[in-house]
């Protein structure tokens, strides 16, 4: 019996009924409800919200809703011993101190339990020394400093501006450079868009606003004390010295008012070029140390945060499938926030809530999806994707056998310009087809499809008439599902115009000013962009859970594999002499890609023609589609990153947020000209080509006729 026979809604109206039930006014109401107090991971307030969501999902009609708890390592400031940075004179007297907290936004003056800005998982320490300004603290910034400018960061405190790359990568780079402390700050060049007022009068960052965030380098490990396994009641925990990904030097974030006071005194080398200058009225001198008059003054950090094993709670809701209950489509987003979470995560959580309500309404009318849908409200995402990762570790055997797809649902908006989608190539056609059926919310596109406005505003750099879809990186809860388990994944949100707004993320990201009012006044007063994101995320889940044949097109994987192979080959060809010397060939990879393309093409033909009324053949074909993403997983993982196991995609080693293609080969080639043992280095390139070629070939064979 197909799921469509098990419903009192006619098949062609299933999706329409689901989408029509989604209401902007409900999303607005849910967002307000989720943002009135802070919901920091590990706190009583966030536990209460978990129980509220559990109760409401049950009311909405899900079959079951359970809390899944774990005891994981979290990090908090010391309530009685605040973190700050000072300038000290030659006598050791503090002549300037940074602020201890952000001034509260209007209407929130009397809210308690607002965690002050801090860098989660910073070790304690009170280092003092000369300051070095390191721009964004990217790999290339340290290359510029160390190799070109001959500036040594060893024993120095570095100050870096937020933006461009994940803050954890900045800290890792600073550690490798020998720094003894890191100060992170938000420069107006990156967090203050021209022509826009600062909060509460616009969406720009005020001078006292500060970005919180974790500074881990977990590489997909989850809880630092229980890598690979769930942090349950009988878990064996590593000692803190063996914990995964913890920084070894103190780190603290500040706003641009305080940064001004540190940077205005900087002496030493001038900035190497204009790309090192922000928008403050300071020289952006690199240092080390302060200029003439102030050369005896030093910077001192005072960091007293503590790491604590704390209980966290995921909410897991189940809507059982009518036909294939053992096939799971997962919609998940986090619930924990740094403060109010007006955008991150509650603009996403409110959308998930409305999607659950709509599915529940259909279920109450007698409908069920073909496949099981799991809904998740993850905890402790902000502390390193901990809730999602621990749950996936606990359920990995089920997920690797039954997981069809994972759709992520963090922030629904980071702007209000156009759609942004990152997903597996398997979902390209699903996203294209769905957005062609949805109305655009954009001004000037009334009566036009979302696909049309999206393509116009964010065109694909390769294919004319198509929209840009990006690679999945990390920094969000899809990581464990995609990068570790090989479950087809995707994410969608509304974004800014990257052409005109060069600032990083949105200005008030992870600050106390990320409030309900920020969204309601400045980003999406009618909640029409939220509704559109709900339609995209919900529509994807609906199709993945309800279509008879899984809406995956393996031919799109073939196209990108060729593109990625060309790209990595051209990177390698920057070293033609070494390729010749060490007999480096990409023939095996190109051959595997060619085989994949042919086999995928034949599989697609069979997919059009097979007898869909035969449940065994249908299940067989769907399993080949479901397991294709899984086939790109290397059980041994990437070098030094065992939990990043996808051979085609991994988070960049230089920026966790960005996706890198053929990451094993890419990392082997990176900065290869500086390696002390070129023979060994090129040997590793060859090994990585071999792994990639084998994996692509093996994946292709999963699409071959089974007998």
């Amino acid at each position: 019996k197909s799921s469509n026979e098990a419903t009192n809604i006619t098949p062609k109206h299933n999706m329409k009924a689901f989408l029509d039930e989604l209401k902007a006014e409900n999303i607005k109401k849910f967002l307000y409800n989720f943002t009135q107090i802070p919901h920091l991971a590990g706190t009583e307030q966030n536990f209460q919200l978990a129980k509220q969501i559990q109760s409401q999902w049950k009311e909405f009609g899900l079959d079951s809703v359970e809390l899944a708890h774990y005891d994981v390592l979290l990090s908090y400031p010391n309530k009685t011993h605040p973190n700050y940075i000072s300038i000290i004179n030659e006598d050791g007297n503090e002549i300037f101190n940074t602020s201890l907290f952000e001034p509260p936004p209007p209407g929130y003056e009397n809210v308690s339990d607002i965690v002050p800005p801090f860098s989660a998982f910073s070790p304690q320490g009170m280092p003092e020394g000369d300051l070095v300004y390191v721009n964004y603290a990217r790999t290339e910034d340290f290359f510029k400093l160390e190799r070109d400018m001959k500036i040594n960061c060893s024993g120095k405190i570095v100050i870096a501006r937020y933006g461009k790359v994940f803050r954890g990568n900045k800290v890792k780079n600073a550690q490798l450079a020998g720094a003894k402390g890191v100060i992170l700050y938000s420069d107006p060049a990156d967090y203050f868009a021209p022509g826009v007022k600062s909060y509460p009068d616009g969406w720009n960052l005020p001078g006292g606003g500060v970005q919180r965030g974790n500074i881990l380098n977990l590489n997909g490990a989850g809880d630092p004390l229980t890598p690979g396994y769930p942090a349950n009641e009988y878990a064996y925990r590593r000692g803190i010295a063996e914990a995964v990904g913890l920084p070894s030097i103190p780190v603290h974030p500040i706003g641009y008012y305080d940064a001004q006071k540190l940077l205005e005194k900087m002496g030493g080398s001038a900035p190497p070029d204009s790309s090192w200058r922000g928008s403050l009225k300071v020289p952006y001198n690199v240092g080390p140390g302060f200029t003439g008059n102030f050369s005896t003054q030093k910077v001192k950090m005072h960091i007293h945060s503590t790491n604590e094993v704390t209980r966290i709670y995921n909410v897991i809701g189940t809507l059982r499938g009518a036909v294939e209950p053992d096939r799971y489509v997962i919609l998940g987003g986090h619930r924990d926030s740094w403060v109010f979470g007006g955008i991150d995560p509650q603009s996403g959580a409110a959308v998930v809530h409305e999607i659950v309500r709509s599915f529940g309404t259909l279920k109450k009318e007698g409908w069920r999806p073909r496949r099981t849908i799991l809904f998740a409200s993850w905890d402790a995402e902000e502390f390193g994707l901990l809730g999602s990762t621990e749950w996936a570790e606990e359920n990995s055997r089920l997920l690797q056998e039954r997981g069809v797809a994972y759709i992520n649902a963090d922030s629904s908006i980071e702007g209000n310009y156009t759609l942004r989608v990152d997903c597996t190539p398997l979902m390209y056609s699903l996203v294209h087809n769905l957005t062609k059926e949805l109305k655009s919310p954009d001004e000037g596109f009334e009566g036009k499809s979302l696909y049309e406005s999206w393509t116009k505003k964010s065109p694909s750099p390769e294919f004319s008439g198509m929209p840009r879809i990006s690679k999945l990186g990390s920094g969000n809860d899809f990581e464990v599902f995609f990068q570790r388990l090989g479950i087809a994944s995707g994410r969608a949100r509304y974004t800014k115009n990257w052409e005109t707004n060069k600032f990083s993320g949105y200005p008030l990201y992870h600050s106390v000013y990320e409030t309900y009012e920020l969204v309601e006044k400045f980003y999406d007063p009618m909640f029409k962009y939220h509704l559109t994101v709900a339609q995209v995320r919900g529509g994807m889940v609906f199709e993945l859970a309800n279509s008879i044949v899984l809406p995956f097109d393996c031919r799109d994987y073939a196209v990108v594999l060729r593109k990625y192979a060309d790209k990595i080959y051209s990177i390698s060809m920057k070293h033609p002499q070494e390729m010749k010397t060490y007999s480096v060939s990409f023939d095996s990879l190109f051959s595997a890609v060619k085989n994949f393309t042919e086999i995928a093409s034949k599989f697609s033909e069979r997919l059009q023609d097979f007898d869909k009324s035969n449940p065994i053949v249908l299940r067989m074909m769907n399993d080949q589609l479901m397991f294709l993403e899984r086939a790109f997983i290397d059980p041994l993982g990437l070098p030094d990153r065992p939990f990043y196991r996808h051979v085609i995609y991994a988070p960049s080693s230089h920026n966790k947020y960005a996706g890198e293609s053929f990451p094993g080969i890419y990392d082997a080639l990176f900065d290869i000209e500086s390696k002390v043992d070129p023979s060994k280095a090129w040997g590793e390139v060859k090994r990585q080509i071999y792994v990639a070629a084998f994996t692509v070939q093996a994946a292709a064979e999963t699409l071959s006729e089974v007998a």
């Epitope: 300037f96 101190n97 940074t98 602020s99 201890l100 907290f101 952000e102 001034p103 509260p104 209007p106 003056e109 007022k197 600062s198 909060y199 509460p200 009068d201 005020p206 001078g207 006292g208 008012y257 305080d258 006071k261």
Partner: antibody, heavy 119, light 107 residues
Framework: EVQLVESGGGLVQPGGSLRLSCAAS????????MAWVRQAPGKGLEWVAN????????YYLDSLKSRFTISRDNAKNSLYLQMNSLRAEDTAVYYC????????????WGQGTTVTVSS | DIQMTQSPSSLSASVGDRVTITCRAS??????LNWYQQKPGKAPKLLIY???SLHSGVPSRFSGSGSGTDFTLTISSLQPEDFATYYC?????????FGGGTKVEIK
């Protein structure tokens, strides 16, 4: 040069009304928060109200909220304070002041206008 | 509301003296503390904002420090034109509140 000139003060009976004005020049008026601060004879300074760039948000001393209204006309580079149901304790010099944003200091002040509430 | 307490309420000093005025907030105001100077019959003038930043045109003999609840205004070498009343003001939260003032008189 930044200039703020208050007017509209004077003698008024208890229960009466008065409208103070502040004419601004020498800067782009719509780029700044504006505020009213008062000083009773021989006393210290007391913040009364402020208003954001376009007048969409106003903030008051709680005890004055029901009687005083701050407003602005950016086209005329003018700030206003409408004071109703005046009381003897409202007697003070009223200063108009400029601020950068919601949290910023008041960096330029007018010379003040005197309001006397007496029967 | 946040109470701002200045001390001393008045002081006598001579030209060339180093003068320190303190301001205490009833709760943590971070660094959102401003200092103003007022001469008799005149409007207040901003001296220092955000605890320690000098407003344009203000002589460098004026400096500010502190954070949280305790703040100081220092005049390193008192000049004749510095005899006036000084007010602190918190800008951290509404309502904005001022200290009671410190009158600096000629000894």
């Amino acid at each position: 040069e930044v200039q703020l000139v208050e007017s509209g003060g004077g003698l008024v009976q208890p229960g009466g009304s008065l409208r103070l004005s502040c004419a601004a020049s020498g800067f782009t008026f719509s780029d700044y928060y504006m505020a009213w601060v008062r000083q009773a004879p021989g006393k210290g300074l007391e913040w009364v109200a402020n208003i954001n760039y376009d007048g969409s948000s106003t903030y008051y001393l709680d005890s004055l909220k029901s009687r005083f209204t701050i407003s602005r006309d950016n086209a005329k580079n003018s700030l206003y304070l409408q004071m109703n149901s005046l009381r003897a304790e409202d007697t003070a010099v009223y200063y108009c002041a400029r601020g950068g944003d919601y949290w910023d200091a008041m960096d330029y002040w007018g010379q003040g206008t005197t309001v006397t509430v007496s029967s | 509301d946040i109470q701002m307490t200045q001390s001393p309420s008045s002081l006598s000093a001579s030209v060339g003296d180093r003068v320190t005025i303190t301001c205490r907030a009833s709760q943590d105001i971070s660094k959102y503390l401003n200092w103003y100077q007022q001469k008799p019959g005149k409007a207040p003038k901003l001296l220092i904002y955000y605890t320690s930043s000098l407003h344009s045109g203000v002589p460098s003999r004026f400096s500010g420090s502190g954070s949280g609840t305790d703040f100081t205004l220092t005049i390193s070498s008192l000049q004749p034109e510095d005899f006036a009343t000084y007010y602190c003001q918190q800008g951290n939260r509404l309502p904005r509140t001022f200290g009671g003032g410190t009158k600096v008189e000629i000894k």
